[in-house]
């Protein structure tokens, strides 16, 4: 059975450079340990933005210096990416791995195009 991962096609970051989206996966089995990775695809290059491994029912824990935060609820992961700038506009792919128990499954979403617009600088006040 293939594992399907769904994510929104387009998300617009807010004025503070924060973008949130839901990554939902159709689990073929009863996973207890899940790893979620956010990847950015620019041209044909893929880089890791952030990753978290969590036990079902527990909170996602990203590294301290991660630009991502998130929460999980069943087969849904609510992801938030912070500190984005216009140059970070691109396709953000959600990858889900069911690490335990066997069998292992991996699924990849089609990607969320995140648009980031840098705020206009405030005009000088006299």
């Amino acid at each position: 059975k293939a594992m399907h991962v769904a994510q929104p096609a387009v998300v617009l970051a807010n004025s503070r450079g924060t973008a949130s989206f839901v990554c939902e996966y159709a689990s073929p089995g009863k996973a207890t340990e899940v790893r979620v990775t956010v990847l950015r695809q620019a041209d044909s290059q893929v880089t890791e933005v952030c990753a978290a491994t969590y036990m079902m029912g527990n909170e996602l824990t990203f590294l301290d210096d991660s630009i991502c935060t998130g929460t999980s609820s069943g087969n849904q992961v609510n992801l938030t990416i912070q500190g984005l700038r216009a140059m970070d506009t691109g396709l953000y792919i959600c990858k889900v791995e069911l690490m335990y128990p066997p069998p292992y499954y991996m699924g990849i979403g089609n990607g969320t195009q995140i648009y980031v617009i840098d705020p206009e600088p405030c005009p000088d006040s006299d």
Partner: antibody, heavy 118, light 108 residues
Framework: QVQLVESGGGVVQPGRSLRLSCAAS????????MHWVRQAPGKGLEWVTF????????YYADSVKGRFTISRDNSKNTLYLQMNSLRAEDTAIYYC???????????WGQGTLVTVSS | EIVLTQSPGTLSLSPGERATLSCRAS???????LAWYQQKPGQAPRLLIY???SRATGIPDRFSGSGSGTDFTLTISRLEPEDFAVYYC?????????FGQGTKVEIK
């Protein structure tokens, strides 16, 4: 650039043990899952075993389960394969391979030959 | 376990001809989870196609992948001398990771 270099192959008698190593360089080793794949002489590719990022999760082909053990040392950027109770049918070139971000095996080592013979 | 069956076992063609290689899965494979590899004698396999149709870095555009579900195809539009090799399909969406038995593309 990404490099994977296997070592430890050789000729060994049936029932004996051998430990293969795969030295990784050119990338952040702990951010990638890794595999061993083997190829018997003149045959196709056979997946052998997988290890997760931190070494906590391991999966094995039925043909090696209970005999082979995969491990990794992220501080040394090295992947290992401990092979016990070797059989003639384990004779093969053993490759280590890196899982790319999107799942395929994007980099492979040059392989190390293991020959099990009396 | 997902069994991958490749056909034909051997393909005899001349340089400049088109090669069409087939890979059939015993159950559904997500299109994001199928790859093709090329292997030449004495060398390690090299990733050609991932996600069923995306070319790996440095792979020429004469190589293309297609398909979904259980039927996948690797096409080499015009065979170059260096393309004569063995080609393997692989699914990487679930354990155990599995490969097809390979298709040998040889010079006619």
């Amino acid at each position: 650039q990404v490099q994977l270099v296997e070592s430890g192959g050789g000729v060994v008698q049936p029932g004996r043990s051998l430990r293969l190593s795969c030295a990784a360089s050119g990338f952040t080793f702990s951010h990638y899952t890794m595999h061993w794949v083997r190829q018997a002489p003149g045959k196709g590719l056979e997946w052998v075993t997988f290890i997760s990022y931190d070494g906590h999760n391991k999966y094995y082909a039925d043909s090696v389960k209970g005999r082979f053990t995969i491990s990794r040392d992220n501080s040394k950027n090295t992947l290992y394969l401990q092979m016990n109770s070797l059989r003639a049918e384990d004779t093969a070139i053993y490759y280590c391979a890196r899982t790319g971000w999107l799942g395929p095996f994007d980099y492979w080592g040059q392989g190390t030959l293991v020959t099990v013979s009396s | 376990e997902i069994v991958l069956t490749q056909s034909p076992g051997t393909l005899s063609l001349s340089p400049g001809e088109r090669a069409t290689l087939s890979c059939r899965a015993s159950q559904e494979v997500g299109e994001s989870e199928l790859a093709w590899y090329q292997q030449k004698p004495g060398q390690a396999p090299r990733l050609l196609i991932y996600g069923a149709f995306s070319r790996a870095t440095g792979i020429p555009d004469r190589f293309s992948g297609s398909g979904s579900g259980t039927d996948f195809t690797l096409t080499i539009s015009r065979l170059e001398p260096e393309d004569f090799a063995v080609y393997y399909c692989q699914q990487y969406g679930s354990s155990p990771w599995t490969f097809g038995q390979g298709t040998k593309v040889e010079i006619k």
